[in-house]
Amino acid sequence: KNLKSPQKVEVDIIDDNFILRWNRSDESVGNVTFSFDYQKTGMDNWIKLSGCQNITSTKCNFSSLKLNVYEEIKLRIRAEKENTSSWYEVDSFTPFRKAQIGPPEVHLEAEDKAIVIHISPGTKDSVMWALDGLSFTYSLVIWKNSSGVEERIENIYSRHKIYKLSPETTYCLKVKAALLTSWKIGVYSPVHCIKTTVENELPPPENIEVSVQNQNYVLKWDYTYANMTFQVQWLHAFLKRNPGNHLYKWKQIPDCENVKTTQCVFPQNVFQKGIYLLRVQASDGNNTSFWSEEIKFDTEIQAFLLPPVFNIRSLSDSFHIYIGAPKQSGNTPVIQDYPLIYEIIFWENTSNAERKIIEKKTDVTVPNLKPLTVYCVKARAHTMDEKLNKSSVFSDAVCEKTKPGNTSK
């Protein structure tokens, strides 16, 4: 009896694992083995595929074959018993294009109200991702074990800290990798669970803010208790993006070591231009808090986030406000190439009742005003990056009278 060729060959590539699966074309024939050949682009000859010769099952692994993952290859398979079937050719493919990103490795550490997640590629020193290893980003899904309500967090790096959790609570999460440069989304890791600890006696400092005074930075924070000492550390923000780096060498700010107030002042020249992360820790001599949430600190924005400049066009029932770039001392506009959000406060000149508008646009309408009434307006800018959380001071107030009631255009 003639052997039929195997059919429906599937090639699965996850990281550096190359797996072939196929269907037997004739289940009634026993003791059949299967063998594969491969052919590289531009070659005429077929080569036996090591790891996939005389296979009795319908699956084989050819990961040991050292292929150029960017080069197209072709496979063929046949069945063998006393005689052999004809070859069945599989559509040619490029391993890199076909490859999926495998599940990453996940390592968890718990605090009372936070979890630290260390993520690394599932395959160490992968050949498949050798040129892309630095481009991995990760996303995760986290939920309380008791509720199952999922929260997604996108675009994180190899170390991520989730804050504002509940003490003594089990959280579960799974992580997957992505290579956005190649439009590849990976496979989720197994689910990992960890229980946060009992609540710490000392909470971490909160509401950390940086401002500029003269040639100094002033770092302020809030704390629940008195008679504490604090220390502040910094880290280059770009280190967070380094996928191989699971050791963050946080550095002390010398003028902010063992300070007894909820602020510290240090010279601007402590930091070169760049983006940094800052964190604060409290101690009462016996106990120490966990570190505060890390805040992002951009020396450029810090120095130059000036209040917005605006013009008002008055109508009978509204103001049109046109926001322009702030001016430096030489009356030249400051170019701010990061997205800002504007907070506009306005009030009737004779009243203290303030109203607020938050707007991303630079032309804003303040509606529902009374005709022939003096209103005052002030504005400030905020960065839109929640981690930077930087605000300018308010501009000086500008007061204008609305037009009489018949001019609404």
Epitope: T197, H246, L247
Partner: antibody, heavy 117, light 107 residues
């Protein structure tokens, strides 16, 4: 292969100083911290301090602040522990260990025996 | 400074038994605790890090657990090569602190 090779046994007189070395291979010490740990006979392990070889920043246990000085030479991929004003209390085995990630002390040196007599 | 208390200086066990070594931190250190095995004339060996993660090459009869202030190292099916001293260590804050050690002996 990651290895931390420590200098050999030392016999020194009280009051003298000694400098122990820890030579790393298979990784770059600039990517890690190098820690030093003391172990006295029939006593436990005591953390002496650590260095960030990248910039020389050090941290010490209060007890060893005046006793120990940790340095590093990145060109030879080596860390050093200098102990001064030696007394019999300093007789111990001294280990270096690396800390490159969340695994903490994942590799240790074989230990250097210091005898003060 | 944080104190890591290993209340049992030594423990007696029989081969094949299950034994639990405990360690108590004087304040909450999260899960930033490691366990080390020390045999005479040898370098310390890292068994457990981050309270519950086994170091590579460590047999799965060694298990770490705990968080906050209370930590345990469990050795199930004790083997003769497990006779050693075991130290816990916190590395959440400086200075790094080791426990005083627990010696495992065979009955």
């Amino acid at each position: 292969e990651v290895q931390l090779q420590q200098s050999g046994a030392e016999l020194v007189k009280p009051g003298a100083s000694v400098k122990l070395s820890c030579s790393a291979s298979g990784f770059n010490i600039k990517d890690c911290y190098i820690h030093w740990v003391k172990q006295r006979t029939e006593q436990g392990l005591e953390w002496i301090g650590r260095i960030d070889p990248e910039d020389g920043e050090t941290k010490y246990a209060p007890k060893f602040q005046a006793k120990a000085t940790i340095t590093a030479d990145t060109s030879s991929n080596t860390a050093y522990l200098q102990l001064n004003s030696l007394t019999s209390e300093d007789t111990a085995v001294y280990y270096c260990a690396r800390h490159c990630n969340f695994l903490y002390f994942d590799y240790w040196g074989q230990g250097s025996t210091l005898t003060v007599s | 400074d944080i104190v890591m208390t290993q209340s049992q200086k030594s423990m007696s066990t029989s081969l094949g038994d299950r034994v639990t070594v405990t360690c108590k931190a004087s304040q909450n250190v999260g899960t930033i605790v490691a366990w080390y095995q020390l045999k005479p004339g040898q370098s310390p060996k890292t068994l457990i890090y981050s309270a519950s993660y086994r170091s590579s090459g460590v047999p799965d009869r060694f298990t770490g657990s705990g968080s906050g202030t209370d930590f345990t190292l469990t050795i199930s099916n004790v083997q003769s090569e497990d006779l050693a001293e075991y130290f816990c260590q916190q590395y959440n804050n400086y200075p790094v602190i080791f426990g005083s050690g627990t010696k495992l002996e065979i009955r």
